[in-house]
């Protein structure tokens, strides 16, 4: 039975030309991480895999750093970069988890951090 | 040497899941060098990637066939295996599973040829 | 996705001739670790394919070598230098840099 709960940054806003880190947090089970993937609709962004490190798509090669820990910076940002962001969490028994943010990158100076919340 | 195998139906009827798998011989899944693929060929035509699966559970699929794909291993088997459901006569193809190579270095890893190929059995979706 | 389109569609040689195939990406397969991962393989009638080439030009254990492959960026060939009549089949390209891994539309090669 899957028992655990992500945890993400939620709805996110952002500065033309910043970055941003992407975080979720998988919690509430005992279960082993064996990767996570970053995706951007259907867009693959990264792969963090407990055993061979990181894999990073290259079209965004030169915009997206590993980490903090499981999570993913996004750097220079557009407009473009506007939309949902999923990380995929591949456990062990349990199965897969899917946590969810949404990225708004605005062009003022007004970008504010979204409230955290939980995905079942 | 390593062998792949396939085995499954070789008739599957509309809106049913297709199930196959790949018994790997000659070595061993729980090998951290190595990427486990499946990939599709239609009639006459070229080849598909469906996705991939490593030996501790993580996997990726092609975009394009996501939302039906499921890729699962079985280390105490040696075997890994592919969920394809809502069948319809455009999944009527050879399928065949591969293993692929893995780079890592610094941190990173990368993915390289297939090597090793099952013989693939014919799917079709008829009722 | 990476697209990748071979020409010539289909190719008839004369044994002993050389042959030559063409693979072009749609986005460079620039590597991030001084290796670009483009592979060449064979697909003989009635069997799976088998690799010929990875990493655009290491020849894979027992490949002979009158088949070499090379190219950057976005353009790759796979030659063969003296067709012989174990050679027909269809031949195709696959990139892996980048998920989903893409095979261009293959090449059959034909002996005259």
């Known amino acids: 039975m899957m028992t655990g709960t992500i945890e993400t940054t939620g709805n996110i806003s952002a500065e033309k030309g910043g970055s941003i880190i992407l975080q979720c947090h998988l919690s509430s089970t005992t279960a082993q991480v064996t990767q996570v993937n970053w995706e951007q609709q259907d867009q693959l962004l990264a792969i963090c895999n407990a055993d061979l490190g990181w894999h990073i798509s290259p079209s965004f090669k030169d915009r997206v750093a590993p980490g903090p820990g499981l999570g993913l910076t996004l750097q220079s940002l557009t407009v473009n970069d506007t939309g949902e962001y999923f990380c995929i969490y591949h456990t062990y028994p349990d199965g897969t988890y899917t946590g969810r943010i949404f990225l708004e990158v605005l062009e003022s100076s007004v970008a504010e951090h979204g409230a955290r919340f939980q995905i079942p | 040497q390593v062998q792949l195998q396939e085995s499954g139906p070789g008739l599957v009827n509309p809106s049913q899941t297709l199930s196959l798998t790949c018994i790997v011989s000659?070595?061993?899944?729980?090998?951290?060098?190595?990427?486990w693929s499946w990939i599709r060929q239609h009639p006459g035509k070229g080849l598909e990637w469906i996705g991939y699966?490593?030996?501790?559970?993580?996997?990726y699929y092609n975009p394009s066939l996501k939302s039906r794909v499921t890729i699962s291993v079985d280390t105490t088997k040696n075997q890994f295996s592919l969920k394809l459901s809502s069948m319809t006569a455009a999944d009527t193809a050879v399928y065949y599973c591969?293993?692929?190579?893995?780079?890592?270095?610094?941190?990173?890893?990368?993915?390289?040829?297939?090597?090793?190929w099952g013989q693939g059995p014919t799917v079709t979706v008829s009722s | 996705e990476i697209v990748l389109t071979q020409t010539p569609l289909s190719l008839s040689v004369t044994p002993g001739q050389p042959a030559s195939i063409s693979c072009k990406s749609s986005?460079?397969?620039?590597?991030?670790?001084?290796?670009?991962?483009l592979s060449w393989y064979l697909q003989k009638p009635g069997l799976p394919p088998q690799v010929l080439i990875y990493?655009?030009?290491n020849r894979f254990s027992g490949v002979p070598d009158r088949f070499s492959g090379s190219g950057s960026g976005t353009d790759f060939t796979l030659k063969i230098s003296r067709v012989e009549a174990e050679d027909v089949g269809v031949y195709y390209c696959?990139?892996?840099?980048?998920?989903?891994?893409?095979f261009g539309g293959g090449t059959k090669v034909e002996i005259k």
């Open positions: 986005q460079s397969l620039l590597p991030s670790d001084g290796k670009t991962y």
């Open positions: 699966i490593y030996y501790s559970g993580g996997t």
């Open positions: 696959m990139q892996s840099i980048q998920l989903p891994l893409t």
């Open positions: 000659g070595g061993s899944i729980r090998s951290g060098d190595y990427y």
């Open positions: 990493e655009v030009s």
């Open positions: 591969a293993r692929g190579s893995i780079a890592a270095r610094s941190g990173y890893f990368y993915f390289s040829g297939l090597d090793v």
